[in-house]
């Protein structure tokens, strides 16, 4: 706490300007009116105040707005935002995308801090859903943002927002997240033609079921190996050799280099060796000729 002392004669601040830069802690406390500070917050960023001075300015705002800052002040916090705690931010009601952008700009180039995570959480909860403009903004600042959300949180993303998602935004998503995002992407892109559809849906395919992969195999899509390796193992296993060949097109040759890795390894174990040999890649480990394959999971389902 800063002691309450009278402001020395002639030092009362009439505006927030660079003359305050060498005010001591107690002088700032005594000579700067909190209401003046609130209306001229945008000027603070142009003045290199020290941490000690910024703490005094924050304290003045906290006293003026004990229930949380109004959005008019929040939008102009600038670098003072980095001095806020998640507890401070939980008191705010941020509704404007411009305010969100202004504060994310301050943290640009850095990892997502607890302050930023709290701010985003408050903003999204206030909006009720992760709309396209918000998602656009968040992924522009934090490409990995989408993959930091739980499957439950992702379920509130409307299909229309999927248009804002770039392939790199999904780089760190796990299968559970892609399971939620894929049906939304399928819905969002459903009116596109074959090749355009594949370009858009490609990065979401880690959540695709077998029947959708079978359908894609009929469309000459030429899926690359990197995408194939990210497919769900359970979705790849039922595909026939012919379907995989059609799905990968000229990239089918890449299977040889990946034969020891999932899902290729597990898929090979489920194929007849005869069928694998038709690829001419030297893939080994298929079911020997003359063996009968019983699908026990299907048998259990029937009984």
């Amino acid at each position: 706490e800063v002691e309450k002392t009278a402001c020395p004669s002639g030092k009362k601040a009439r505006e927030i300007d660079e003359s305050l830069i060498f005010y001591k802690k107690w002088e700032l406390e005594a000579c700067v009116d909190a209401a003046l500070l609130a209306t001229q917050m945008d000027r603070v960023n142009a003045i290199p105040f020290t941490y000690e001075q910024l703490d005094v300015l924050k304290h003045k705002l906290d006293e003026l707005y004990p229930q949380g800052y109004p959005e008019s002040v929040i939008q102009h916090l600038g670098y003072l935002f980095l001095k806020m705690s998640p507890e401070d931010i939980r008191k705010w009601n941020v509704t404007s995308l411009e305010t969100l952008k202004a504060l994310l700009e301050v943290n640009k180039g850095h990892e997502m801090s607890p302050q930023v995570a709290t701010l985003i959480d408050r903003f999204v909860k206030g909006r009720g859903q992760l709309d396209k403009d918000t998602l656009d903004t968040l992924t522009a600042f934090y490409p990995g943002y989408l993959c930091s959300l739980s499957p439950e949180e992702l379920s509130s993303v409307p299909p229309s927002s999927i248009w804002a998602v770039r392939p790199q935004d999904l780089d760190t998503c796990d299968p559970r997240q892609l399971d939620v995002l894929y049906p939304k992407a399928r819905l969002a892109f459903q009116n596109m033609n074959g090749s355009e559809y594949f370009v858009k849906i490609q990065s979401f395919l880690g959540g695709a079921p077998t029947e959708d992969l079978k359908a894609l195999s009929q469309q000459n899509v030429s899926m690359d190996l990197a995408t194939f390796m990210k497919l769900r193992t359970d979705a790849v296993l039922p595909l026939t050799v012919a379907e995989v060949q059609k799905l990968l097109g000229p990239h089918v040759e890449g299977l040889k280099a990946e034969e020891r890795h999932r899902p290729v390894r597990d898929w090979i174990l489920r194929q007849r060796q005869d069928d694998l040999d038709t690829l001419g890649l030297g893939l080994q480990g298929g079911i020997p000729n003359g063996y009968l394959v019983l699908d026990l999971s299907m048998q259990e389902a029937l009984s």
């Epitope: 660079e18 003359s19 060498f22 142009a46 290199p48 941490y51 670098y79």
Partner: antibody, heavy 120, light 106 residues
Framework: QVQLVESGGGLVKPGGSLRLSCAAS????????MSWIRQAPGKGLEWVSY????????YYADSVKGRFTISRDNAKNSLYLQMNSLRAEDTAVYYC?????????????WGQGTLVTVSS | IQLTQSPSSLSASVGDRVTITCRAS??????LAWYQQKPGKAPKLLIY???SLESGVPSRFSGSGSGTDFTLTISSLQPEDFATYYC?????????FGGGTKVEIK
């Protein structure tokens, strides 16, 4: 890219004067507070003087107060240090440095320095 | 605010882990920066806000600490790291520097 180039250093007798200049380029000079920092031979760094973006707020270290004058010309993207009544202990490399904008008050870009030698 | 660096100099070999400390005469929160200076060159900013790495600085450099005690660590010393290192506080004016730590080749 950001560049700061100092000039004006040299050999001067005790009691003499010297004017250092710093030419800035690669950034909006008028948006930044600027500093002079010096380093005596084999010694550490000393923050000597500081000037606000408009030039109206100035700081001097006690060791140079009343003898040195900092100024700037935003139209010419230049920073100056007028040094009067020089003493042997003012012998140092003088660096012009830009003060970063943002939460931290630090020196994000420095010039290569100019050597001032005060000796009879 | 006075900053005291230790040691004032140290000898180390390439690949060594090197630790330099900076102690403030009073609490300065995380308001501390570290600079590297090579002979005949201007100082270069390495770390700010005690632990944030300046853009373009190798990840072998790291900073830690808060209050009065701070540390600069070089996880695996490289030939280009032999230099003098300075800390600087920006908690309050006047801004001050530590006395420096010279890292020499053993």
């Amino acid at each position: 890219q950001v560049q700061l180039v100092e000039s004006g250093g040299g050999l001067v007798k005790p009691g003499g004067s010297l004017r250092l200049s710093c030419a800035a380029s690669g950034f909006t000079f008028s948006d930044y507070y600027m500093s002079w920092i010096r380093q005596a031979p084999g010694k550490g760094l000393e923050w000597v003087s500081y000037i606000s973006s408009s030039g109206s707020t100035i700081y001097y270290a006690d060791s140079v107060k009343g003898r040195f004058t900092i100024s700037r010309d935003n139209a010419k993207n230049s920073l100056y240090l007028q040094m009067n009544s020089l003493r042997a202990e003012d012998t140092a490399v003088y660096y012009c440095a830009r003060t970063s904008r943002g939460l931290c008050v630090l020196f994000d870009y420095w010039g290569q320095g100019t050597l001032v030698t005060v000796s009879s | 605010i006075q900053l005291t660096q230790s040691p004032s100099s140290l000898s180390a070999s390439v690949g060594d882990r090197v630790t330099i400390t900076c102690r403030a005469s009073q609490g300065i929160s995380s308001a501390l920066a570290w600079y590297q200076q090579k002979p005949g060159k201007a100082p270069k900013l390495l770390i700010y806000d005690a632990s944030s790495l300046e853009s373009g600085v190798p990840s072998r450099f790291s900073g830690s600490g808060s209050g009065t005690d701070f540390t600069l660590t070089i996880s695996s010393l490289q030939p280009e790291d032999f230099a003098t290192y300075y800390c600087q506080q920006f908690n309050s004016y006047p801004l001050t520097f530590g006395g420096g730590t010279k890292v020499e080749i053993k």
